[in-house]
């Protein structure tokens, strides 16, 4: 509770608290916290958890107060709530507090994980689902394939993860993902560890000459969720093996980039 004098919810309904440009920002950005009351108020207060006194006051005879946080630092991140009051209320009486707003001030968001679902081995013809999992909701998730400039797939998700489906026959390759805030100014996560998808039994010795690094044949554009690698027509796969990439030298096997661009 913010103060001992907070009345019942029905008495003075809670205000709404929002942040501009976003609730996740990089250090140095100017952030405006907007507190909107359901009725004209006289004083607005911005509170942090466990503090009786407001962090900031705004005396405005309207339904909206703005609290300016200039060039925010990570220390200014955390949970905020706002309340409002009117002059005809008793001393120290505030409205119900707004829902919490969590402000995150960070240079980069935590690294997501990239895993294959439902399991590590996928039979021929089956689709492969890759899950890019971060820690924050309402982010945009981006799936990249090594050797392709533009992202392979892009998802906005209300959950802290996004699932990307790859067509089984077109799946072999090396993948990584990011997530970032859904609108500018963007805050970016670290890149995930890479995930290699390869045909079961395939290794340096099984790799067809036609798919040497840098060699590309005609194929779908990079926006195709199943941008495919050069044809393995003479190879009969039993299933797909999905594995985290281990450190390797340039001479060791690395999936050829997909034939993603007509002009490459």
């Amino acid at each position: 509770d913010i103060t001992p004098s907070v009345p019942p919810a029905s008495y003075h309904p809670k205000p709404w608290l929002g942040a501009q440009p976003a609730t996740v920002v990089t250090p140095g950005v100017n952030v405006t916290l907007r507190c909107r009351a359901p009725q004209p108020a006289w004083r607005f207060g911005l509170f942090k958890p466990g503090e009786i006194a407001p962090l900031l006051f705004r005396d405005v005879s309207s339904e909206l107060a703005e609290f300016f946080l200039e060039e925010v630092t990570p220390a200014q991140g955390g949970i905020y709530r706002c309340c409002y009051r009117r002059p005809d209320w008793g001393p120290g009486v505030w409205s119900q507090p707004s829902d919490v707003l969590e402000l995150l001030v960070t240079e980069e968001l935590p690294r997501p994980s990239l895993v294959a679902l439902p399991g590590p081995v996928v039979g021929p013809g089956a689709n492969v689902s890759l899950r890019c999992a971060g820690r924050l909701r309402n982010m945009s998730f981006v799936l990249y394939r090594e050797g392709v400039a533009a992202p392979l797939q892009y998802r906005h998700s209300a959950q802290p993860w996004a699932d990307f489906t790859l067509l089984g026959a077109r799946a072999p390759g090396t993948y990584s993902c990011y997530y970032h805030t859904p609108s500018a100014p963007y805050v970016l996560s670290q890149r995930s560890e890479v995930l290699v998808i390869s045909w079961e039994g395939e290794g340096p010795e099984a790799r067809p000459a036609s798919s040497a690094p840098g060699m590309q044949a005609p194929g779908p554009p990079p926006s195709d969720p199943g941008a495919q690698a050069p044809s393995l027509s003479s190879f009969r796969p039993r299933g797909l093996v999905l594995q985290p990439l281990l450190p390797q030298t340039q001479d060791s096997w690395d999936p050829a980039p997909p034939p993603s661009d007509p002009g490459v």
């Epitope: 240079e107 090594e146 890149r191 554009p221 490459v264």
Partner: antibody
Framework: QVQLQQSGAELAKPGASVKMSCKAS????????MHWVKQRPGQGLEWIGY????????EYNQKFKDKATLTADKSSSTAYMQLSSLTSEDSAVYYC??????????WGQGTSVTVSS | DIVMTQSPSSLTVTAGEKVTMSCKSS????????????LTWYQQKPGQPPKVLIY???TRESGVPDRFTGSGSGTDFTLTISSVQAEDLAVYYC?????????FGTGTKLELK
């Protein structure tokens, strides 16, 4: 803050090789692809290629495939580019740049290479 | 390879003037995966490395003044400076960020009268 510090200017003879460095700081080196771009005096920009430091995967512009070799050292957060069989055409400023999902958002100050006998 | 063609090659303007420059690509740069155009604009001042102005054809990089606006889709793109300032003297490059090899336009040099 993010910084890409490139090694100093190089003067080399035709036929020789040079290896330049790009030391990254202020970010997680293995989370970003490192690109290299060439700019000849008074000319435009040419993309050479990139390296993914976390896997050592490289992608080259075909034009530079036999000219440039990209490597990276995770332990020192440093990307390298070696240019071989130098000719006067290789006299240029070479930039390293960090690649985010949006653009090449941070660039080194450039390494000037002069090839002269 | 995707060829990027910029015009004009140079522009001489007075401070406060509105400027537009064009960039055309030989192939569409629209990524159907997220409906974004993978076209980036860079500004390069003398003796400095390039600096990102606009990515995804129209998204302004953080810290870039709002007088810079990118527009266009597919193969035709435009960079507009609403009111040119003395510090905008530079060469402006567009870049294909859609497919490898990444390719740059030849640049538009902005000069002040």
């Amino acid at each position: 803050q993010v910084q890409l510090q490139q090694s100093g200017a190089e003067l080399a003879k035709p036929g020789a090789s040079v290896k330049m460095s790009c030391k990254a700081s202020g970010f997680t080196f293995t989370s970003y692809w490192m690109h290299w771009v060439k700019q000849r005096p008074g000319q435009g920009l040419e993309w050479i290629g990139y390296i993914n430091p976390s896997t050592d995967y490289t992608e080259y512009n075909q034009k530079f495939k036999d000219k440039a070799t990209l490597t990276a050292d995770k332990s020192s957060s440093t990307a390298y580019m070696q240019l071989s069989s130098l000719t006067s055409e290789d006299s240029a400023v070479y930039y390293c740049a960090r690649r985010s999902p949006f653009a090449m958002d941070y660039w080194g100050q450039g390494t000037s290479v002069t090839v002269s006998s | 390879d995707i060829v990027m063609t910029q015009s004009p090659s140079s522009l001489t303007v007075t401070a406060g003037e509105k400027v537009t420059m064009s960039c055309k690509s030989s192939q569409s740069l629209l990524n159907s995966g997220n409906q974004k155009n993978y076209l980036t604009w860079y500004q390069q001042k003398p003796g400095q490395p390039p600096k990102v102005l606009i990515y995804w054809a129209s998204t302004r990089e953080s810290g870039v003044p709002d007088r810079f606006t990118g527009s266009g889709s597919g193969t035709d793109f435009t960079l507009t400076i609403s009111s040119v300032q003395a510090e905008d003297l530079a060469v402006y490059y567009c870049q294909n960020d859609y497919s490898y090899p990444l390719t740059f336009g030849t640049g538009t040099k902005l000069e002040l009268k």
